[in-house]
Interface confidence: low
């Protein structure tokens, strides 16, 4: 598409004849008819192919026409054409003397025509005009002519449509030979696809417009680059989105459970070991002095009857004394100056004399001891439960009643619940102080995952774009399979696709 | 807002007709191709049919040559396909695109589609 334009430029008839050298009356009006045809080797009448035009009346015999309009009609004159400029022409140029103010050809007498010039021959599209000028025996006529294409037209042949836009189909302007060019932040072949903020990932991260970084569900920070955690994930990170990778020490499917005890809360008093039994669990191996579940208890050193044969004990700063009844010496009070001579058992204590009669040794009856089976048995003086146990007297014997946990003769054993695999369905055990927990999988619970609880993960329509959705039976939650055109965990995002097709 | 709303799809015996729509909205509908590519559940989208903005370039796939047949009424902004002599093999989704250009190029914006069945 584009117009031949004309340019008019002076037109010279001295004497004011008509072609038929006929004076005109007073002077010749003159105007002008134009037809533009395609290419003929001789110029022949007939349908003006690619268009006329007609001025008004331009003055008279002889006159320069102005480059404005003028009375109406226009200068340059105007021949569009809806085509490919074929690059090459005929042009008739008629000028007609206008008796009265009715210029159409009908109201005209037949000799009213001044001159008549014919031309043909190539023509490209440009910018620059070309001068010509027609001289016949009577008049001359100088002018001159282009081709240029119409708004949004380029090419050689204005046969290339480009109209700059900047909306939903493209971004962009148009270069002298029809090509795009981009605007500021815009790409691709029509310039429809956004250039992202510098450094948005490529795969996490899109943009709507220039310089933006959208993130992708599950990722987030300027550049999309860093992964969004499990929704409740409290010790842990993600290297892919809605994970939870716990940290040293921390368990559980939230890593919310802690599993070095020791090191985070130091239950241990007095210099004790700490070691860690599980999930909140620890034991305290205690140093000399000390006891209780945590070794927060003093231990006094008379407290372990050191003393025998009937001695008292004093507790002292650097340990203890004993005071030995009459007969007895040592330490511990452990030597003896009786013998069996002395009746020195108690409690019917049976005698048995030493190192020849010098020393002597009481064997005592049962719920009885000491050197001269003076005491009556006490089993639970020497605190022989271990991690908080209470120390029963049982006749000649004790028993310890262990604190939920423990087992063993003296409380020793730690006792796992956990070790009868209690929970059912693929649940998680948890050993706790007073018993166990179970925590279970997706799809099940109870106080030991017994009971069935699947639920339908697609009955809330979560996913959009006439996508399907299937539930996944090991975790009870959804996916969604998009249809062409949609990307997103929920299908939500429209993309604009590649041209995959054959067209 | 760009949107392509198809319609005219449904259950048809192996032999049949049927004609789909695509009303188009949120442009300058003269200045755009729009085509219909289908995609039958597991498998790939096929582009099956185009017509360019001027309504004079128009595309068929092989699968469906001689048997289908795009139309366009810019007045109405609607993009038609007639489809004859269907076959089993042609139950699919059908859906309406434009590449956002005059020329069959590629797509930018697609309907929600249609569903066409062929069973006897």
């Known amino acids: 598409s584009g117009v031949f334009q004309l340019q008019l430029q002076e037109f010279i008839n001295e004497r004011g004849v008509l072609a038929s050298g006929r004076p005109c009356e007073p002077g010749c009006r003159t105007f002008f008819r134009v037809c533009l045809k395609h290419f003929q080797a001789v110029v022949s009448p007939g349908p003006c192919t690619f268009g006329t035009v007609s001025t008004p009346v331009l003055g008279t015999n002889s006159f320069a026409v102005r480059d404005d309009s003028s009375g109406g009609g226009r200068n340059p004159l105007q021949l569009p054409f809806n085509f490919t400029w074929p690059g090459t022409f005929s042009l008739i140029i008629e000028a007609w003397h206008a008796p009265g103010d009715d210029l159409r050809p009908e109201a005209l007498p037949p000799d009213a025509l001044i001159s008549k010039i014919a031309i043909q021959g190539s023509l490209a599209v440009g910018q620059n005009w070309l001068l010509d000028e027609q001289t016949s025996t009577l008049t001359r006529l100088r002018y001159s002519y282009r081709v240029i294409c119409s708004d949004n037209y380029y090419g050689d042949n204005c046969s290339r449509l480009c109209k700059k836009r900047n909306d939903h189909f493209g971004h962009y302007v148009c270069q002298p030979d029809g090509n795009l060019s981009c605007l500021p932040g815009w790409t691709g072949e029509y310039c429809q696809q956004p250039i992202c903020l510098s450094g948005c990932h490529e795969q996490n991260g899109y943009c709507s417009k220039p310089a933006e970084c959208l993130c992708r569900p599950g990722w987030q920070g300027r550049l999309c680059n860093e992964c969004i955690p499990h929704n409740g994930c409290r010790h842990g990170t993600c290297s892919t989105p809605w994970q939870c990778t716990c940290d040293e020490g921390w368990g559980g499917l939230f890593c919310d459970q802690d599993l070095n005890y020791c090191t985070h809360h130091s239950p241990c008093k007095n210099g004790a070991t700490c070691s860690n039994s599980g999930q909140r669990s620890y034991t305290c191996t205690c140093r000399p002095g000390y006891t209780g579940v945590d070794c927060e208890l003093e231990l006094s050193e008379c407290d372990s009857n050191p003393c025998r044969n009937g001695g008292s004990c004093k507790d002292q700063e650097d340990g203890y004394h004993c005071l030995c009844p009459p007969g007895y010496y040592g330490l511990h009070c452990e030597h003896s100056t009786l013998s069996c001579a002395d009746s020195p058992c108690f409690n019917g204590g049976s005698c048995r004399e030493r190192n020849q009669g010098a020393n002597y040794a009481c064997e005592c009856p049962p719920n009885f001891t000491g050197s001269n089976c003076e005491k009556k048995v006490d089993r639970c003086t020497s605190n022989p439960c271990a991690n908080g146990g209470q120390c029963l007297n049982r006749g000649p014997s004790r028993m310890c009643r262990c604190r939920p946990g423990f087992t063993g003769t003296y409380c020793e054993l730690h006792v796992s619940d956990c070790a009868r695999n209690p929970c059912a369905h693929g649940g998680t055990c948890h050993d706790l102080e007073n018993g166990l927990m179970c925590t279970c999988p997706a799809g099940f619970s109870g106080r030991r995952c017994e009971v069935r609880t699947s639920i339908d993960a697609c009955a809330s329509s979560p996913c959009f774009n006439r996508a399907t959705c299937y539930t996944d039976l090991s975790t009870d939650t959804f996916v969604c399979n998009c249809p062409y055109g949609f990307v997103g965990s929920r299908c939500e995002f429209p993309v604009g696709l590649p041209p995959s097709f054959p067209w | 807002e760009v949107q392509l709303v198809e319609s005219g799809g449904g259950l048809v015996q192996p032999g049949g007709s049927l004609r789909l729509s695509c009303a188009a909205s949120g442009f300058t509908f003269d200045d755009y191709a729009i085509g219909w590519f289908r995609q039958a559940p597991g498998k790939e989208p096929e582009g099956i049919s185009c017509?360019?903005?001027?309504?004079?370039?128009?595309y068929y796939a092989d699968s469906v040559k001689g048997r289908f047949t795009i139309s366009r009424d810019n007045a109405k902004s609607t993009v038609y396909l007639q489809m004859n002599s269907l076959k089993p093999e042609d139950t699919a989704v059908y859906y309406c695109a434009t590449p956002g250009i005059a020329a069959c190029r590629g797509i930018h914006y697609t309907g929600q589609g249609t569903q066409v069945t062929v069973s006897s």
């Open positions: 017509i360019s903005s001027s309504g004079g370039i128009t």
